[in-house]
Amino acid sequence: LDSPDRPWSPLTFSPAQLTVQEGENATFTCSLADIPDSFVLNWYRLSPRNQTDKLAAFQEDRIEPGRDRRFRVTRLPNGRDFHMSIVAARLNDSGIYLCGAIYLPPNTQINESPRAELSVTERTLEPPTQSPSPPPRLSGQLQGLVIGVTSVLVGVLLLLLLTWVLAAVFPRATRGACVCGSEDEPLKEGPDAAPVFTLDYGELDFQWREKTPEPPAPCAPEQTEYATIVFPGRPASPGRRASASSLQGAQPPSPEDGPGLWPL
């Protein structure tokens, strides 16, 4: 995009090409060669019909946000540079962007910066074989949060696994009784526990240990257990199904998950 024969401009808009994953922040820098007494700085996106759609503006030391609050303009301390950021970029934010300055009287005129291109790519999920870890290039705030949540989940799952193994192995060793029914369903939600935040991992396929003694017939063991992990503070939502031997790494929340973790 940024051809070498582009004319000199009192406005620059960089980088000329920017690629981010969806959910990440995309930040351009609009720089003025100098600051006139009075000016308005606008941030535009080029529409498919080559029209400029205004996203946000800066005027008289005041930020004027557009309709979509995800588009933010921040003046940097040197006064000539402005960060123009898309918070939690979406796939359809891909396109051509530029900034424009309107210099007010006595010498009213308009300057437009060179164009820059934003590409928002789909978030790449980690392959199932990898250990749970946050995807790369998460923002600092989210990184700590995701690591914490992941650690808690892994701990809880390990505890569940240990509890289940103990409950499954010891009664069988002592009494030889069949415990493959639903009597020992772990962490069953009580009727008075609402409201709860339910992260339902659904079907967890635990592999039976080879050394576990065969239960007496006619009790054929099922290969499936169900686990519901309960957190206080949010109503239950439909969960994902996952195998215990191939649990996905914890993913950061998508913007659709609500405003809790994403800046407005």
């Epitope: 004319p7 000199w8 060669a33 100098d34 006139p36 007494d37 006595p106 010498n107 005129q109 437009e112």
Partner: antibody
Framework: EVQLVETGGGLVQPGRSLKLSCVAS????????MSWTRQAPGKGLEWVAS????????YYPDSVKGRFTISRDNAQNTLYLQMNSLRSEDTATYFC?????????????WGPGTMVTVSS | DIVMTQTPSSQAVSAGEKVTMSCKSS????????????LAWYQRKPGQSPKLLIY???TRESGVPDRFIGSGSGTDFTLTISSVQAEDLAVYYC?????????FGSGTKLEIK
């Protein structure tokens, strides 16, 4: 009425320094971008230096870069050109020019010029 | 650097005649995104400082008589004086402001027969 008046020209020996001044009137000096342009005897016009309205950005051709410095005092409505390590090829009439179309470097107004002669 | 070449270096015409002078740039001065040509024309009369005539290749500066017409695009530009007057005796320069360093043509000297 826009007026630009250059002073400070004269005869100077090679290797020495000279400082030109340009006093502006008739317009809001601190809103506009300013330049120096010169014309050697019998030659064409040559751009020498440019400065933005508050002085934060300056521009020079390779022929004077590192030897000449453009600056401005907006309180005094004055533009300067500090010329060091002068050479005989710097002999010319120096014009102070204004770029009233903010951010585009064509020159709306020119001063009458001041003559600089570099000779031993 | 962008090199500006002006032709002819001088020409003599009679009052009332039409005159054209050429300015060529070593690279295009047309910026596709704003459709503007970054070219200006100046007039320098004997004993005077230069005066802006035309900018954006074809926009006349206020106060400039309409007999001065700028045209052209990309690398080839023309200044036309539709009916030369005695007071048009001068050297005419083109200048590109597309990029630094700013550069001028060597000038076309207009003489009146």
């Amino acid at each position: 009425e826009v007026q630009l008046v250059e002073t400070g020209g004269g005869l100077v020996q090679p290797g020495r320094s000279l400082k030109l001044s340009c006093v502006a009137s008739g317009f809001t000096f601190n809103n506009y971008w300013m330049s120096w342009t010169r014309q050697a005897p019998g030659k064409g016009l040559e751009w020498v230096a440019s400065i933005t309205n508050s002085g934060v950005s300056t521009y020079y051709p390779d022929s004077v870069k590192g030897r000449f410095t453009i600056s401005r005092d907006n309180a005094q409505n004055t533009l300067y050109l500090q010329m060091n390590s002068l050479r005989s090829e710097d002999t010319a009439t120096y014009f102070c020019t204004s770029a009233l179309n903010w951010g585009y470097w064509y020159f709306d107004f020119w001063g009458p010029g001041t003559m600089v002669t570099v000779s031993s | 650097d962008i090199v500006m070449t002006q032709t002819p270096s001088s020409q003599a015409v009679s009052a009332g005649e039409k005159v054209t002078m050429s300015c060529k740039s070593s690279q295009s001065l047309l910026y596709s995104e704003n459709k503007k040509n970054y070219l200006a024309w100046y007039q320098r009369k004997p004993g005077q400082s230069p005066k802006l005539l035309i900018y954006w290749a074809s926009t006349r500066e206020s106060g400039v008589p309409d007999r001065f017409i700028g045209s052209g695009s990309g690398t080839d530009f023309t200044l036309t004086i539709s009916s030369v007057q005695a007071e048009d005796l001068a050297v005419y320069y083109c200048q590109q402001y597309y990029n630094f360093p700013l550069t001028f043509g060597s000038g076309t000297k207009l003489e009146i027969k």
